[in-house]
Amino acid sequence: SSSPTSSASSFSSSAPFLASAVSAQPPLPDQCPALCECSEAARTVKCVNRNLTEVPTDLPAYVRNLFLTGNQLAVLPAGAFARRPPLAELAALNLSGSRLDEVRAGAFEHLPSLRQLDLSHNPLADLSPFAFSGSNASVSAPSPLVELILNHIVPPEDERQNRSFEGMVVAALLAGRALQGLRRLELASNHFLYLPRDVLAQLPSLRHLDLSNNSLVSLTYVSFRNLTHLESLHLEDNALKVLHNGTLAELQGLPHIRVFLDNNPWVCDCHMADMVTWLKETEVVQGKDRLTCAYPEKMRNRVLLELNSADLDCDPILPPSLQTS
């Protein structure tokens, strides 16, 4: 799992009446925020399922793994984790399932070691373009983030404020070119209808990309060419109908790639011929023997690898004079 984990060694729970320290004051070495559990040995703080409405101000400076899951945070303001002295060791931050709907510019500033961030299962209606870059400069200081987990961050459909959700997320990923070092990006279960064409080209260090359980219909305008380090591409449970020659060639050209394509509604007509030929030859598709046709009806559940060119026909389009009403 990509979420921060910790050993179970000696967690201390703070007394509920412990007064919170002002964030400008250095916390006591053994201090643990109210409603949290702390293990200095594991460098871990867990404030889980406590209905917190803000990030505790008095986090211990030793924290390396911080769990703030299952809370009611709603908003992450600028500098939400800025402390004096800074949380210089914080490397893994899990904020999943904390009812966040707004992440403001600079929310993760002053976390120089933050490598792993999980914002999954939050209804992010308002993700600032500068949430991860921290500034609106055309080129920002590089973010230390290596792993960004954004699964199921789509808000309910009537609460997306008439903006492109895909566009909002991509703007945050690309702002200031801050995420050039990102190696893992998970965007599963977000109802994505399309992938903006420039997003992958600007994340050249990606090793793992998870786009599973979205509503992607086509990859025609998406280029994988620059992703020479890509090791896994998860496209399961989308609405893909066919992969065209350009995409197939780009995927085949990636030296370390494994592609996952299960549970897509493949359309097995004449446009599928190139993909079937490629599937028979390629080693990059994991579980390729499980891929089956969804359409047309006569082809439903046929295994793609077992098809030949004679199976893949397109109904002729009749000229207008021959069409019946």
């Epitope: 409405t53 803000e54 009611q72 945070l73 709603a74 908003v75 009812r99 709907d101 707004e102 209804p123 209606a125 308002d126 808000p155 309910p156 609460e159 404020q161």
Partner: nanobody
Amino acid sequence: QVQLQESGGGLMQAGDSLRLSCVVSGVTWNSYTMAWFRQAPGKEREFVAAIRWTVDTTYYADFVKGRFTISRDYAKKTMYLQMNNLKPEDAAVYYCAVGRKWPKADDYWGQGTLVTVKP
């Protein structure tokens, strides 16, 4: 110009139910909090409940949990406070507020609506 207008207060008996409304206009933020506060005579204003406008996350003061329910109608730009099993100590002027903080929004305030509860 942000404006807030409360309504729905009145003279009630202990055990009754009442619904307060607050109409908001002029807000330009994408995301914001709306909240209810109350102030009884001779006491400080205290937080009652809050709701996030975009995704209706809610939060309550401990003393109203289980009796009061905050909600909002996105289309009507109206927030509500459903108050059940009213107690004499619930008597106060109830104010709605809007702001960017969570949960104690305090950027703009309404004029208040009076709730009186007879024993």
